[in-house]
């Protein structure tokens, strides 16, 4: 039932892509939470921000992240599709001046302070895989997405469209 | 150029069926969620359901589920909708509609079959 | 579900004229909202997603602007192609309902 991996055919095309606008065409604050419903929190430690990914007691307020959406353009060489090859990246900032940033040299993800323009490492291009669940591939390293390993956040390669649906890589966006 | 043709429309007597199909070309069918959208004559829109051709995940307007299905055959490009137990208050022009982004799904249906009637009457 | 509401259902305008459409979401749905135009016996046409982007190739007469519960379509200078009917809808978030048109037809 899976098509063409995504994640191989588009490898040069989104490396090349550009962000079409500087300025997000929309942003949504909502909390985050794993497939099988772990709430992702941030909590400042040391001056720094550490991310992790627990059961959150009842009643405990979830932390929120502001999702900025950008649209990106396909190389229409490579998109089949011409000028209509749009993909939606996203950055998220769980805080002021915070972003997640894809760390490729040791699979990890950080929180970085930074100033706009953003640097690459802190997009995202945004899958579907359900209608209810998104996952998030690094701009700067396709076919590795964000995912959870030993109750934190990863990067974590994948090779196939089959393993796009594997849980680890799947979250859930709560806007209440 | 993108290009989705709609057939399998006509004439159907009150709780019998119809299968939809949508012919999906000039684009990686793979990768775009694909939607049903109705109106009936006169009418206003109203959207049916959708469907990740490369995941099989789908999701519905909960007015349809359980006597309409949302399927997809990649090897066809094809989209398909099998409508079952079906009333006089389905009578509509059926179209497909793909949204504008790769892999994601927004609901905005930027490019739109020519749509197929389906007429319930007996 | 969240409901959209149209205002004119139907008006009469003149070539040259300044015309514009209101929609009113139920609730607060942000800026996820997108216009479309639908001419007799045709698809429609996607001219505005995301309340304010024209779509590629929409003529920049369209315009469209609001977020919350109240978004408006203003077309500057209607010319004789744009007699239609023109639709809101919310979208985004499951399921994505419609508002229920506008018609635009020659004074």
């Known amino acids: 039932a899976f098509g063409i991996s995504g994640v191989q055919k588009y490898t040069r095309a989104l490396h090349d892509s550009s962000i079409t606008g500087i300025s997000p065409i929309t942003e949504y604050l909502a909390s985050l939470s794993t497939y099988n419903d772990q709430s992702i929190t941030f909590a400042l430690e040391d001056e720094s921000y550490e991310i992790y990914v627990e059961d959150l007691k009842k009643d405990e307020k979830k932390d929120k992240v502001l999702l900025s959406y950008y649209e990106s353009q396909h190389p229409s060489n490579e998109s089949g599709d011409g000028v209509d090859g749009k993909m939606l990246m996203v950055t998220l900032s769980p805080t002021k001046d915070f972003w997640l940033h894809a760390n490729n040299k040791e699979h990890s993800v950080e929180l970085h302070k930074c100033e706009k323009p953003l640097p690459d490492q802190a997009f995202f291009v945004l899958h579907n895989m359900h209608s209810n669940c998104v996952s998030f591939e690094c701009k700067t390293d396709p076919g590795v997405f964000i995912g959870v390993k030993d109750n934190h956040l990863a990067l974590i390669k994948v090779d196939s469209s089959e393993n796009l649906c594997t849980e680890n890589i799947l979250f859930k966006l709560s806007e209440t | 150029e993108v290009q989705l043709v709609e057939s399998g429309g006509g004439l159907v007597q009150p709780g019998g069926s119809l299968r939809l199909s949508c012919a999906a070309s000039?684009?990686?069918?793979?990768?775009?969620?694909v939607s049903w959208v109705r109106q009936a004559p006169g009418k206003g829109l109203e959207w049916v359901a959708e469907i990740y051709p490369n995941s099989g995940a789908d999701n519905f307007n909960e007015n349809f589920k359980g006597r309409f299905t949302i399927s997809v055959d990649n090897a066809k490009n094809s989209l398909y909708l099998q409508m079952n137990s079906l009333r006089a208050e389905d009578t509509a022009v059926y179209y497909c509609?793909?949204?504008?982004?790769?892999?994601?799904?927004?609901?905005?249906?930027?490019?739109w079959g020519q749509g197929t009637l389906v007429t319930v009457s007996s | 579900d969240i409901q959209m509401t149209q205002s004119p259902s139907s008006l009469s305008a003149s070539v040259g004229d300044r015309v514009t459409i209101t929609c009113k979401a139920s609730q607060n749905v942000g800026n996820n909202l997108a216009w479309y135009q639908q001419k007799p016996g045709k698809a429609p046409k996607l001219l505005i997603y995301?309340?304010?982007n024209r779509y590629t190739g929409v003529p920049s007469r369209f315009s469209g602007s609001g977020s919350g519960t109240d978004f408006t379509l203003t077309i500057s200078s209607l010319q004789p192609e744009d007699f239609a009917t023109y639709y809101c809808q919310r979208i985004y978030n499951s399921p994505p309902t419609f508002g229920g048109g506008t018609k635009v037809e020659i004074k």
């Open positions: 000039g684009f990686t069918f793979t990768d775009y969620w």
């Open positions: 995301y309340a304010s």
């Open positions: 509609a793909r949204g504008p982004y790769y892999y994601s799904t927004q609901i905005i249906f930027a490019y």
